[in-house]
């Protein structure tokens, strides 16, 4: 089943997020992803947990998952590199790098996104954009076209309250508000973009969507710059 989750958002402007990727299993959307280099897509490690026997591919240049679009192209995956410390039972280190079978054909609808290398927290209250093909309501309706929502960054202390995530948010994670607007099932691995720069990746833990006391959790890419560099090099 798709992992992670856009609730309370709206349809994105077609092809305005040329870095957006759909990680697919056996031809169906599984998770979001973000093109970070010509031949590399960053996603969440948990996305591939149940994909052992399936065919993993990456769709780039898409707005609609089903309709033909000139910019759409499905790439095979040459190599999948989950972070060595990712584990099924935790949200920590939930990153995955997928090497495409060839360099992506770049254009207006396919373009890597610069990612944050400076390891500093995004200021609380900063509005960040999260996009994905995850479910759009509690009934589990899956959209065909890319959705997005603007979410304010939530400070770690609040996110770690006992009533919220109870200390689970380490320095390598960040939170965004989840009051009716939220990332949801199927959005995992997708990008949290602040000021045009990739700051976070939607984690793929199973949490309730749209509940303000259970903020969205995102892996801070800046905290993993050394690992990302070492794989991409």
């Amino acid at each position: 089943p798709p992992r992670g989750r856009i609730l309370g958002g709206r349809e994105a402007e077609a092809h305005a997020r040329p870095y957006m990727a759909s990680v697919q299993l056996n031809g169906a959307h599984l998770c979001g992803g973000v093109l970070v280099a010509e031949q590399w897509v960053l996603s969440a490690a948990h996305c591939l947990e149940d994909a052992a026997d399936g065919k993993v591919q990456v769709l780039l240049g898409a707005h609609s998952l089903s309709q033909p679009e000139p910019s759409k192209r499905l790439y095979d995956v040459l190599r999948a590199v989950p972070h060595p410390d990712s584990q099924p039972d935790t949200i920590d280190h939930d990153l995955l790098l997928l090497q495409l079978s060839e360099k992506a054909t770049l254009g207006p609808a396919v373009r890597p996104l610069p990612w944050q290398r400076v390891d500093r927290d995004v200021a609380p209250g900063t509005l960040c954009d999260v996009a994905g093909w995850g479910i759009v309501n509690h009934a589990g309706r899956r959209p065909d076209s890319l959705q997005h929502v603007l979410l304010p960054v939530l400070d770690r202390a609040t996110c770690n309250r006992r009533t919220h995530h109870d200390g689970a948010i380490t320095e390598r994670l960040m939170c965004a508000e989840s009051n009716r607007r939220d990332s949801c099932k199927g959005d995992s691995g997708g990008p949290l973009v602040c000021g045009g720069v990739l700051e976070g990746v939607v984690t793929s833990g199973s949490r309730v969507c749209g509940n303000r006391k259970k903020p969205g959790i995102y892996t801070r890419v800046a905290s993993y710059a050394a690992w990302i560099d070492s794989v991409l090099a």
Partner: antibody, heavy 122, light 107 residues
Framework: QVQLQQSGAELARPGASVKMSCKAS????????IHWVKQRPGQGLEWIGY????????NYNQNFADKATLTADRSSSTAYMQLSSLTSEESAVYYC???????????????WGAGTTVTVSS | DIVMTQSHKFLSTSLGDRVSITCKAS??????VAWYQQKPGQSPDLLIY???TRHTGVPDRFTGSRSGTDFTLTISNVQSGDLADYFC?????????FGGGTKLEIK
């Protein structure tokens, strides 16, 4: 086999600059990122930074950002490090190193040069 | 910056003994830790990476372990060729940082 051959010892005056080299052999030069590490006599190791020879992308330890300049010459399969405005603090052995590692993730180093000794003295 | 603390600058052991060299990270580094051996006048040699994985050709007398942010290199059946300096390194975050080193000596 894979080797990193470093240039010979340097004696320099305070305020001067030195440029040392690290010549790679036994592999395609653009395949591996070259890192530089400093070791002062009887001390630990300090990471200076790296250069990716295929893209010339550099990444510096901020403690060395104004001190070291990393470059690479693909035609001679050689990486260079220039140290400027030398003081006695720069008297050290400087190593170049790469990660061949079959798993291709993580910046640990399994091939090292023999080191270049820099002595700064008036 | 992440500080890697090797609390023992020197460790004395006897040939044939088992010795543990420790290294503590100042914050979470996952398992992104390597260990190196350095003999006088030589460059460092990689022993262990990703906390547990022995580098090619390293004898199985050398093992790496971890408890949280505490990392240990254990050498069993110490031989004369093991007398050297040992350094830990974290590569979880930039800047990459090394421990101050532990010199293994004979009692």
């Amino acid at each position: 086999q894979v080797q990193l051959q470093q240039s010979g010892a340097e004696l320099a005056r305070p305020g001067a600059s030195v440029k040392m080299s690290c010549k790679a052999s036994g592999y395609t030069f653009t395949t591996y990122t070259i890192h530089w590490v400093k070791q002062r006599p009887g001390q630990g190791l300090e990471w200076i930074g790296y250069i990716n020879p295929s893209s010339d992308f550099t990444n510096y330890n901020q403690n060395f950002a104004d001190k070291a300049t990393l470059t690479a010459d693909r035609s001679s399969s050689t990486a260079y490090m220039q140290l400027s405005s030398l003081t006695s603090e720069e008297s050290a052995v400087y190593y170049c190193a790469i990660r061949l590692g079959y798993d291709r993730q993580g910046w640990y180093f399994d091939v090292w040069g023999a080191g270049t000794t820099v002595t700064v003295s008036s | 910056d992440i500080v890697m603390t090797q609390s023992h600058k020197f460790l004395s052991t006897s040939l044939g003994d088992r010795v543990s060299i420790t290294c503590k990270a100042s914050q979470d580094v996952g398992s992104a830790v390597a260990w190196y051996q350095q003999k006088p006048g030589q460059s460092p040699d990689l022993l262990i990476y990703w906390t547990f994985t022995r580098h090619t050709g390293v004898p199985d007398r050398f093992t790496g372990s971890r408890s949280g942010t505490d990392f240990t290199l254990t050498i069993s059946n110490v031989q004369s060729g093991d007398l050297a300096d040992y350094f830990c390194q974290q590569y979880s975050n930039y800047p990459l940082t090394f421990g101050g080193g532990t010199k293994l000596e004979i009692k």
